[in-house]
Every structure is written in structure tokens, then in C-alpha cells.
């Protein structure tokens, strides 16, 4: 009896959908695996007789509930199928946006770049797919614990009237208000403000 794959899960970030599993202990030899997806009542092979423990399902429609399954094989024997269901538009993880930060005196000027949909040629982004897409920004003085959050209305934001000659850190994430779903935070970017440009009277 061939044991089934273990810890079967979908690792999906920005619609790059990788089905992953672990090979079970099996004394007779090395196992291979076949992974399939349900396409209009018929299961279609995606990865056949692979020695890998993952399979790329990124071509599946972003919109729809998909049934995927994987089994282990050895010679003419095979395990039972392990099934999972997956809806990319609901389940994919929203990766961190890009961010450009520029210091102008006592202000930080930020521009945000929505994460790209993985593995497509064109520059479609997660913002294209989700109508309610917005950004959350959090910033703080470097070395302090107190963080401030803002929700920019556009793909850019300016933090004004900051303390001069002070290092501020900023990070951004995508947020979908209609789904109450937050993406991953970008790595913090820390920049030092310069002088206050106001001229004394």
C-alpha cells in the first residue's frame, strides 16, 4: 500500500499558485507524484510522475473554485488522492508593494507600486484585479515603538512637517476594504529628514 502525500497545501502569492506536499515515508523506494486539476468534470494532469514535491497551477483562472488533487506512486501501485479546493482571487496572498521614497527637507515623498501578477507577460498588477485596492502605510521614528497608519487615496503620499534631522521608517501594504483583506508589508525604508525650509520672519 502506497501512503498518500502529506501536508498538501497551496502556496499562492500574487496568483503564482504552487501546490506543495511532502513525501511520506516509504520503505520500498523513491515515490513519484501526479497532480491534477478538475476542468469541467474531468481531472486533467498537470504534473505527471514527478519526483518533485510541488506543482505549478498558476495557469488556472483567477476567478473560480478549483479542485486539485495529488497522489503518490510506486511502480504499478498508487496512493489515494489527496484533494484540496482553492479559489485564487479569494485565497492568494497579496505580496508586498514596491515603494519609492524621496526626502525633501522635512517631508517624505512616497510612491507605491502594486505587486505584479506573477508569470504574465504584460504588466497587469494586483490593483487591476481588485477593484477596491488601496494602500495602508505605516511610519515611525526609527528607534521608537509608536507607529502611525495612514490610508493614501492615490499611488503616492507625502508625510509633511516631520522633525528635521530625524530618521523615519516607512512600509506599505495592499489592502482590500471590501474583503477586509490585507497584504504583506513591504520591507521598511528608513530615510533621514533634513532641515525645515520655513524661513524665520
Amino acid at each position: 500500500m502506497v501512503p498518500p502525500p502529506e501536508n498538501v497545501r497551496m502556496n499562492s502569492v500574487n496568483f503564482k499558485n504552487i501546490l506543495q506536499w511532502e513525501s511520506p515515508a516509504f520503505a520500498k523506494g523513491n515515490l513519484t507524484f501526479t497532480a491534477q486539476y478538475l476542468s469541467y468534470r474531468i481531472f486533467q494532469d498537470k504534473c505527471m510522475n514527478t519526483t518533485l514535491t510541488e506543482c505549478d497551477f498558476s495557469s488556472l483562472s483567477k476567478y473560480g473554485d478549483h479542485t486539485l488533487r495529488v497522489r503518490a506512486e510506486f511502480a504499478d501501485e498508487h496512493s489515494d488522492w489527496v484533494n484540496i479546493t482553492f479559489c485564487p482571487v479569494d485565497d492568494t496572498i497579496i505580496g508586498p508593494p514596491g515603494m519609492q521614497v524621496e526626502v525633501l527637507a522635512d517631508s517624505l515623498h512616497m510612491r507605491f507600486l502594486a505587486p505584479k501578477i506573477e508569470n504574465e507577460y504584460e504588466t497587469w498588477t494586483m490593483k487591476n484585479v481588485y477593484n477596491s485596492w488601496t494602500y495602508n502605510v505605516q511610519y515611525w521614528k526609527n528607534g521608537t515603538d509608536e507607529k502611525f497608519q495612514i490610508t493614501p487615496q492615490y499611488d503616492f503620499e507625502v508625510l509633511r512637517n516631520l522633525e528635521p534631522w530625524t530618521t523615519y521608517c516607512v512600509q506599505v501594504r495592499g489592502f482590500l476594504p471590501d474583503r477586509n483583506k490585507a497584504g504583506e508589508w513591504s520591507e521598511p525604508v528608513c530615510e533621514q529628514t533634513t532641515h525645515d525650509e520655513t524661513v524665520p520672519s
Epitope: G64, W124, N128
Partner: nanobody, 126 residues
Framework: QVQLQESGGGSVQAGGSLRLSCAAS????????MGWFRQAPGKEREGVAA???????RYADSVKGRFTISKDNAKNTLYLQMNSLKPEDTAMYYC????????????????????WGQGTQVTVSS
């Protein structure tokens, strides 16, 4: 929400021609990958032809040289020109779309398209 509406089906003699249309609304049309599928009675739905947002096309072996897929971005319409029709082409023909898609995956399978029309019937008699 993407909406697709097929038209142009009908009855024709073997060797004849038909042109199917699929009017799309609800998304930036140029971002679609689109396809034509068909389903004969008692059979599974199968891919006929597909076109990516960059204009590259693919065909099922059974229709190569006879069918041509095209799209008019200005009219938000997908077409399937079917020539030299055969009785085995008889089926319900469906238009399908996957928004925000390019040529990266060469989509041809039902599960790779998220939005579907209601279908138009094509009947080819001998």
C-alpha cells in the same frame, strides 16, 4: 463583472461556413485572454481556439486550417470564422474570457478561463 454574449450560430450544410461573435463587457477588453469552446451532446466541453491579449492564437488539431479566431478590441468582440464545416463540428459553442491575462500560460483548458457566455448552437448536416 464580465459579461459575454455569443451569436451567429445556426444550421448549415457540410462544407458551409458560419461566423460566431462574442460581445464582451465589464473589463478593459484588451486585457482578456479569450477562447472558443464547444460541447457536443453527451461529450465533454473542449477547447476549439484561443487568443491571448497579445494576439497570439492556438487551435485544436481538429479545426486547424478551417477555423480562425480573431478579436476586434475597438468593438469588444471576439470572432470565430468557421469554414469547411463538418457534421462532427455540431455542438454548442461557448465564448470564454480570463481578464488580466497575457500570453504567459497558453491557456486552452476550461479551468483556465473564469467567465463564460451562455452558448450558441451550431448544427452541421450532411
Amino acid at each position: 463583472q464580465v459579461q459575454l454574449q455569443e451569436s451567429g450560430g445556426g444550421s448549415v450544410q457540410a462544407g458551409g461556413s458560419l461566423r460566431l461573435s462574442c460581445a464582451a463587457s465589464g473589463y478593459t477588453y484588451s486585457s482578456y485572454c479569450m477562447g472558443w469552446f464547444r460541447q457536443a451532446p453527451g461529450k465533454e466541453r473542449e477547447g476549439v481556439a484561443a487568443i491571448d491579449s497579445d494576439g497570439s492564437t492556438r487551435y485544436a488539431d481538429s479545426v486547424k486550417g478551417r477555423f480562425t479566431i480573431s478579436k476586434d478590441n475597438a468593438k469588444n468582440t471576439l470572432y470565430l470564422q468557421m469554414n469547411s464545416l463538418k457534421p462532427e463540428d455540431t455542438a454548442m459553442y461557448y465564448c470564454a474570457a480570463e481578464p488580466y491575462c497575457s500570453g504567459g500560460y497558453k491557456r486552452t483548458m476550461v479551468a483556465e478561463f473564469g467567465y463564460w457566455g451562455q452558448g450558441t448552437q451550431v448544427t452541421v448536416s450532411s
